[in-house]
C-alpha cells in the first residue's frame, strides 16, 4: 500500500482551510479523549479511479468521498483519519485531514474526497473514514467503513495500467486446446514478442470435483524473433485415469517485466457427455 | 503456508556428481507436479526439469543438461530429488525446487563446480 506520488496532497476548499498528513493510524484523540466529539462521516462512497504519476505510469487509486451530517457537532470536527486495511496482508495506511479552521454550516452539504491510495489488481481492501477527535471509549462511534474490490487485469481498463502491463496483460495468447485420441490433448497459443520462456501446467480433475487428480507441467523454450507472435503447439500426455476427464490448461509467461510472477492465462476441457441411456425393459417377467 | 527446503549442494570438481533434494511441508505432496531452476552468476533464471504427480512418469529436461540430470520423487517422502552427474562448469548456479501450480519457491542450494 503506498499513496500516488509525494507531491502536496490538499485537502483545503472554499470556507476551509486544511492540509493532509501521514498518519500512524493512532490518532492522539485515542490516547486523550476529549468530551465533545463529532458524529460520523455520511454516505461514504468508494469508487476505482485510475490517476497518473508525474512520471507518467498509470496506476488504479481508490477514491474515497463522503459528506458530513448537518448538525452542530461540525463545531468540534477537526479533521478526519482515511484508513486503507488490504485484507489479504493486513497491511494498513492512514493518512489524515487536519482543519486548519473552523467549520461553519453554509447552503450546501460538507463533501470531502482523497484519491491518492494506490491499490492492487484482484485485492480487496476496507476502507474507513474516522472524524476527529475520535470518541470517548463507550461512545457513538464516529466512522464509516466500506469494503472495496479492485478488479483483475482482465477488466478493460485495469488492462493498460502500469502494474497489470508488468505482470503481461497486454499478451493474449488465445489458447486453444483439443481432445486427441490416445489419452492426449493439443494446446495451441500465440507467442509474445519476447524470447522468454513458457510453462504449460495441465491439472485434471474428476467430473464433479475440485481436487486434482493428475497434474504435470510442461516447459517451452524461449522462441526465436521469428516466431514471435506465432503459434506454439503442444502435444500433452494425460494420465488414463477413468473419470479423470476435466482438464485445466494454464500458461505461465516468464516475461523480463515480471519474471516469476506475470500473469496466467488458462483454458479449460470439460468431461466427455455422457449419453443418456434408458434403463434395459427385460424381456420377459418373472413370476416370482 | 508451503515450505519447500532444498539441500545437497556444495564444491564438486567437474565429472562429479550431487544428489540435491527439495523437501515439501505438505501431506498432499503427491498430487503436485514439481520441477526445479537453476540461476547462475548474472543470468535469469533457467528451467532444469520437471516431474509429473503421483508416480512422476512424465518427465521433461532442459537440452542442457538431458542424459547428465535425472529427476525424481517419493512421495512418502514428501521429496523431490535431482541426481546430477557430470558436472561442468557451466552448471554452476543456485537450484531451486519449484511447485508450478502456486508458484511456491525454496531458497535454493548452491551448486559450484569447479574445474
Known amino acids: 500500500l503506498r499513496l500516488l506520488d509525494h507531491r502536496a496532497l490538499v485537502c483545503s476548499q472554499p470556507g476551509l482551510n486544511c492540509t493532509v498528513k501521514n498518519s500512524t493510524c493512532l490518532d492522539d484523540s485515542w490516547i486523550h479523549p476529549r468530551n465533545l466529539t463529532p458524529s460520523s462521516p455520511k454516505d461514504l462512497q468508494i469508487q476505482l479511479h485510475f490517476a497518473h504519476t508525474q512520471q507518467g505510469d498509470l496506476f488504479p487509486v481508490a477514491h474515497i468521498e463522503w459528506t458530513l451530517q448537518t448538525d452542530a457537532s461540525i463545531l468540534y470536527l477537526e479533521g478526519a483519519e482515511l484508513s486503507v486495511l488490504q485484507l489479504n496482508t493486513n497491511e494498513r495506511l492512514c493518512v489524515r485531514f487536519e482543519f486548519l479552521s473552523k467549520l461553519r454550516h453554509h447552503h450546501r452539504r460538507w463533501r470531502f474526497t482523497f484519491s491518492h491510495f494506490v491499490v492492487d489488481p484482484d485485492q480487496e481492501y476496507e476502507v474507513t473514514v474516522h472524524h476527529l477527535p475520535k470518541p470517548i471509549p463507550d461512545g457513538d462511534p464516529n466512522h464509516q467503513s466500506k469494503n472495496f474490490l479492485v478488479p483483475d487485469c482482465e477488466h478493460a481498463r485495469m488492462k493498460v495500467t502500469t502494474p497489470c502491463m508488468s505482470s503481461g496483460s497486454l499478451w493474449d495468447p488465445n489458447i486453444t486446446v483439443e481432445t486427441l485420441e490416445a489419452h492426449q490433448l493439443r494446446v495451441s497459443f500465440t507467442l509474445w514478442n519476447e524470447s522468454t520462456h513458457y510453462q504449460i501446467l495441465l491439472t485434471s480433475f474428476p467430473h464433479m470435483e475440485n481436487h486434482s487428480c493428475f497434474e504435470h507441467m510442461h516447459h517451452i523454450p524461449a522462441p526465436r524473433p521469428e516466431e514471435f507472435h506465432q503459434r506454439s503447439n503442444v502435444t500433452l500426455t494425460l494420465r488414463n485415469l477413468k473419470g479423470c476427464c476435466r482438464h485445466q490448461v494454464q500458461i505461465q509467461p516468464f516475461f523480463s517485466s515480471c519474471l516469476n510472477d506475470c500473469l496466467r492465462h488458462s483454458a479449460t476441457v470439460s468431461c466427455p457427455e455422457m449419453p443418456d441411456t434408458p434403463e434395459p425393459i427385460p424381456d420377459y417377467m418373472p413370476l416370482w | 503456508e508451503v515450505q519447500l527446503v532444498e539441500s545437497g549442494g556444495g564444491l564438486v570438481q567437474a565429472g562429479g556428481s550431487l544428489r540435491l533434494s527439495c523437501v515439501a511441508s505438505?501431506?498432499?505432496?503427491?498430487?503436485?507436479?514439481m520441477a526445479w531452476y537453476r540461476q547462475g552468476p548474472g543470468n535469469q533464471r533457467e528451467f532444469v526439469a520437471t516431474?509429473?504427480?503421483?508416480?512422476?512418469?512424465?518427465?521433461q529436461y532442459a537440452d542442457s543438461v538431458k542424459g547428465r540430470f535425472t529427476i525424481s520423487r517419493d512421495n512418502v517422502k514428501r521429496t523431490v530429488y535431482l541426481q546430477m552427474n557430470s558436472l561442468k562448469p557451466e552448471d554452476t548456479a543456485v537450484y531451486y525446487c519449484?511447485?508450478?501450480?502456486?508458484?511456491?519457491w525454496g531458497k535454493g542450494t548452491l551448486v559450484t563446480v569447479s574445474s
Open positions: 519449484n511447485r508450478p501450480r502456486d508458484n511456491y
Open positions: 516431474i509429473s504427480s503421483d508416480d512422476g512418469d512424465i518427465i
Open positions: 505438505v501431506s498432499t505432496f503427491s498430487l503436485y507436479s
